[in-house]
């Protein structure tokens, strides 16, 4: 199986230099001083979020670091390389024919990326074909300044898209979460992600997933029957990474989808989600943009109750309190609501079965000129045991044919002050949103309202 030599930290090979790898050779993208770096690891995880403009929270509400700030900081940190996987790029207002001051943060990010290239820092981008941003010029602008860009033809390879959203910086730092490389993700869409600093073990593991995209981005690429050993992961749900994050004992691993892009040792994204749900004993709180126990992008749709069944089983079989917060905006498919009502109908407090579903409506306000925005785009789940931060919406395609990643983190609530674990921080963010006035019960979301904020 012929693949191009993958990038080392300082250099991404140009598209037209195909090389072959020996099975079992050491991963070419790991820097020679990897071991030395790993000994210096002092992992730190920071939750990051975007709150759409004009969406005030109650005073004193918990919050995470603003995503735009975190991204700019990550780029300031970069010394050698930035590898970005993103469904699409649209960092400027003119890309979508919009003149709005809220695009400035995205435009600043694009500038920062260009400056990065000017400082001889390598930028490699894996993006999707098909894409949502067919008129965007961002990647042409960056490529003209030396960025290496590959379109991964997921439509042809798996009948899906590359839906992942993550960065690996210098083989040490990571961003992953719900936000695409889109100015709206910074100011007009509600997003949730995580930044992990100084954690080369995890960064180089996620880099292996980037590499699966990178090698599939060459002309006429085909999916390998078996991925070469270089792509294998040592961290998974059976054998997670163990480390101290700010002194807190932590286990973590990355999952991936679809199965065809899971080399040996990589936990499948769906399996990771189900494992986190299955281990919950007290609560499962999930915030997702879309929830469909069906396929989404095939005609006619097929029924696919895997996640739905898991939530029902947890609530009914183990008395786990289930809360599902679903995005609701002008571009939400209304055929989702019967499925949400069906799930909610299982709730029976008298029998200790607690299932609650709400939709989160971001008021459009005076931002109606900005298409495909003003929505809760998050994809995370939290239980008393673990935090799951993902890039996938909850329907079959995202696990069977679409490329995505998930991060599962568990921290021990031991020596550190209460409330400091990642799962506790994430629970607080969920509860802030759940109890906000923008979270509307299904009874309050009458059909035909089209997710328009009623105030």
């Amino acid at each position: 199986w012929q693949v191009p030599r993958p990038p080392t930290w300082g250099q991404v090979q140009p598209k037209d230099v195909p090389r072959s790898w020996e099975h079992g050779s050491s991963p070419a993208w790991e820097p020679l001083e990897a071991e030395a770096r790993q000994q210096r690891d002092s992992c730190q995880l920071v939750l990051v979020e975007s709150i759409p403009q004009d969406l005030p929270s109650a005073a004193g509400s918990p919050s995470a670091q603003p995503l735009g700030q975190a991204w700019l900081q990550l780029l300031d940190t970069a010394q050698e390389s930035v590898h970005v996987a993103s469904y699409y790029w649209s960092l400027t207002g003119p890309d979508i024919g919009v003149n709005d001051s809220s695009s400035q943060l995205g435009e600043a990010l694009l500038q920062k990326l260009q400056q990065l290239l000017g400082r001889n820092i390598s930028l490699a981008v894996a993006t999707s074909s098909p894409t949502l941003a067919r008129t965007s010029t961002d990647l042409q602008v960056l490529a003209a300044r030396g960025a290496h860009v590959r379109q991964v033809p997921m439509g042809r390879l798996t009948r899906g898209v590359l839906h992942s959203k993550f960065w690996v910086v210098d083989g040490r730092h990571i961003y992953m979460g719900s936000a695409n490389m889109d100015w709206r993700s910074l100011t007009q869409v509600k997003e949730l992600g995580a930044v992990i600093y100084n954690c080369s073990h995890l960064a180089q593991d996620l880099e292996k997933t980037f590499q699966t995209y990178w090698v599939l981005g060459v002309p006429k690429a085909v999916l390998p029957k078996t991925w070469p050993q270089n792509f294998s992961s040592h961290f998974n749900r059976f054998q997670p990474f163990h480390g101290l994050f700010d002194g807190v004992p932590t286990t973590a691993y990355f999952s991936a989808s679809p199965p065809a892009l899971c080399p040996q040792g990589r936990t499948r994204d769906l399996e990771a989600l189900l494992a986190v749900m299955g281990s919950a004993q007290e609560f499962i709180y999930a915030s997702v943009m879309e929830y469909f126990p069906t396929t989404r992008f095939s005609h006619p749709p097929r029924y696919w109750p895997v996640l739905d069944n898991a939530l029902r089983a947890a609530a009914f079989g183990k008395g786990v309190r289930v809360r599902l917060l679903v995005g609701c905006g002008l571009n939400t498919d209304p055929t989702m609501f019967p499925y949400l009502r069906s799930l909610q109908a299982l709730s029976n407090p008298a029998a200790n079965v607690s299932v609650d579903v709400k939709v989160f409506i971001v008021p459009v306000g005076n931002h109606s000129n900005i298409p495909f925005s003003r929505v809760n785009h998050s994809k995370f789940m939290v239980t008393e045991k673990a935090a799951y931060i993902g890039t996938s919406n909850w329907s079959e395609d995202y696990f069977s044919s679409t490329a995505g990643v998930g991060l599962v983190v568990t921290q021990s609530p031991g020596a550190q002050p209460a409330g400091a674990t990642v799962q506790e921080q994430l629970r607080q963010l969920f509860e802030r949103d759940w109890s906000s006035r923008y979270a509307v019960g299904l009874d309050g979301q009458a059909p035909g309202q089209d997710c328009v904020w009623q105030g």
Epitope: Y87, S129, P130, T131, L132, R134, T135, Q151, G155, R156, V161, H163, M289, E290, R296, F297, G327, G329, L330, N331, T332, D333, P334, S368, N369, P371, F372, V375, H377, N393, D450
Partner: antibody, heavy 124, light 107 residues
Framework: DVQLQESGPGLVKPSQSLSLTCSVT???????YYWTWIRQFPGNKLEWM?????????NYNPSLKNRISITRDTSKNQFFLKLNSVTTEDTATYNC?????????????????WGAGTTVTVSS | DIQMTQTTSSLSASLGDRVTISCRAS??????LNWYQQKPDGTVKLLIY???RLHSGVPSRFSGSGSGTDYSLTISNLEQEDVATYFC?????????FGGGTKLEIK
């Protein structure tokens, strides 16, 4: 079932304006699609003329930009085509159609419902 | 604008035949291509979207393929009801553009 039906005069004089209505049943024109006009000239050539989006914004074919206007009446669930300064070259069958679906994250767009079309002849 | 060309304006085939209709774009449209069927009464129906995906209710004898600038629609087992004109359409950029159509008749 979603249905689109075009209506309007079958004959228009040169230099006048052509005005057509598309009546939509079974789906709200304020939801999830671009509501489009497409015309078919004698000899079969199809031309995309433009759309009015679910949110009321417009996009027009540059070849028609100075002459075309697409508007809507949400209370009647109708959208309209107005083409000014017509010539005999505008003789065609005019179809309305919807393009989408414009759901978050969906990259696959197509014209999935078409009207039957209405023939307009431009002649003095 | 992207020009879409269907070089064969009409073709004739026998019932049961395998028929292929081709479409060429003036530039790479990255698989953003749809196919439509227009019956003799003028009714237009979506057949295939994004090069190869069958729309709901379309018989499986229809299939699509292609990449870059060259695309094709195949009918594997021609039936009488397939008599129609077939159009390709790109949705890579605005303005949307259509091929000139290929009229399919039965011998």
């Amino acid at each position: 079932d979603v249905q689109l039906q075009e209506s309007g005069p079958g004959l228009v004089k040169p230099s006048q304006s052509l005005s057509l209505t598309c009546s939509v049943t079974g789906y709200s024109i304020t939801s999830h699609y671009y509501w489009t006009w497409i015309r078919q000239f004698p000899g079969n050539k199809l031309e995309w003329m433009g759309y009015i989006s679910y949110d009321g914004s417009n996009n027009y074919n540059p070849s028609l930009k100075n002459r075309i206007s697409i508007t809507r009446d949400t209370s009647k669930n109708q959208f309209f085509l107005k083409l000014n300064s017509v010539t005999t070259e505008d003789t065609a069958t005019y179809n309305c159609a919807r393009e989408g679906p414009l759901y978050y994250g969906n990259p696959y767009w197509y014209f999935d419902v078409w009207g039957a079309g209405t023939t307009v002849t431009v002649s003095s | 604008d992207i020009q879409m060309t269907q070089t064969t304006s009409s073709l004739s085939a026998s019932l049961g035949d395998r028929v292929t209709i081709s479409c060429r774009a003036s530039q790479d449209i990255d698989n953003y291509l749809n196919w439509y069927q227009q019956k003799p009464d003028g009714t237009v129906k979506l057949l295939i979207y994004y090069t190869s995906r069958l729309h709901s209710g379309v018989p499986s004898r229809f299939s699509g393929s292609g990449s870059g600038t060259d695309y094709s629609l195949t009918i594997s087992n021609l039936e009488q009801e397939d008599v129609a004109t077939y159009f390709c359409q790109q949705f890579n950029t605005l303005p949307r553009t259509f091929g000139g159509g290929t009229k399919l008749e039965i011998k």
